[in-house]
């Protein structure tokens, strides 16, 4: 299949990935679908270096990432292993807090104003970051 060798216009290249930073807010599921329609996924943070890069671009603003526990265990949207992977939770987070009064707990992860992570109600309209890998083969079948 074809390969993406450079980032689309409006996207930022970093370490062989392309990132797009929203400037408005959506619920987590809408942000997830948004990235999928761009052949991307909500950002998956795999290192402290990537954390710093994303944090630099989003500033002190609540921003969704591609991490959720809507089906039980915490999972990254691209299948990256959560248990062995990089984590940057705020102290005492995630806490699946029910006291917000919105029904249910907190199943979606976001960057907080200091960059550390918190779990929150997935319906909150936060900004989001899409990520796609360079040199990733597209999902089209090869031409025969």
């Amino acid at each position: 299949g074809s390969e993406r060798t450079c980032c689309p216009v409006n996207w930022v290249e970093h370490e062989r990935s392309c990132y797009w930073f929203s400037r408005s807010g959506k619920a987590w599921a809408d942000a997830d679908n948004y990235c999928r329609l761009e052949d991307a996924h909500l950002v998956v943070v795999t290192s402290w270096e990537e954390q710093k890069f994303v944090q630099h671009h989003i500033g002190p603003v609540n921003t969704w990432m591609g991490l959720h526990d809507q089906n039980g265990p915490w999972k990254w949207v691209d299948g990256t292993d959560y248990e062995t992977g990089f984590k940057n939770w705020r102290p005492e987070q995630p806490d699946d807090w029910y006291g917000h009064g919105l029904g249910g707990g907190e199943d979606c992860a976001h960057f907080t104003d200091d960059g550390r992570w918190n779990d929150d109600v997935c319906q909150r309209p936060y900004r989001w970051v899409c990520e796609t890998e360079l040199d990733k083969a597209s999902q089209e079948p090869p031409l025969l």
Epitope: W11, Y34, L37
Partner: antibody
Amino acid sequence: EVKLLESGGGLVQPGGSLRLSCAASGFTFNNYAMSWVRQAPGKGLEWVSVLSGSGGSTFYADSVKGRFTISRDNSKNTLYLQMSSLRAGDTAVYFCARYCSSARCPYDAFDIWGQGTMVTVSS
Amino acid sequence: DIQMTQSPSSLFASVGDRVTITCRASQSISDYLNWYQQKPGRAPKLLIYDTSSLQSGVPSRFSGSGSGTDFTLTINSLQPEDFATYYCQQTYNILPERSFGRGTKLEIK
């Protein structure tokens, strides 16, 4: 000139199948999500399906899920809609439309439309 | 799902009039609202995006306003070519199922 041209519409019996095509020109086709939107006679616009630029992500309206399949051939700059188990309620003009998001455009919108192709489901 | 309610469903006006069409969302959509114009037998055409931004080539007599749940499309000094059906569309939900209003048909009085 940026252009979309649908074809493949016609009269089909209930339960039958039909494949619509949409030929794109004037823009880099594989950079954009593409969609089908339909309009029943005298009615409003109803979104049917959308897929990403590579074709890797697809989404459907509940009313067509399991019956319609959206696909694309980026080497031919063509979008398709395979329709099966057709019902009278599927009778409509089917438009293909480019979906441009704010990750690429100044907006999130259907910004380029074809002229439409009529699908009539009747015995 | 977010429901979009347009009013009125039809509107009679004369050339030179100022007309307003409203669109209400069942929950807040911030400014994620587009307006389209459709003439009989033709494809819809994007007029306004993000509530108030005019698409390239659209005359300045068209304007949009609103935020949250209530939005308006205003046409100042109606021209003969403006008689058409107008649809609002929310894009807060990325998947646009039920995202269009039912339309407002603007007809000559």
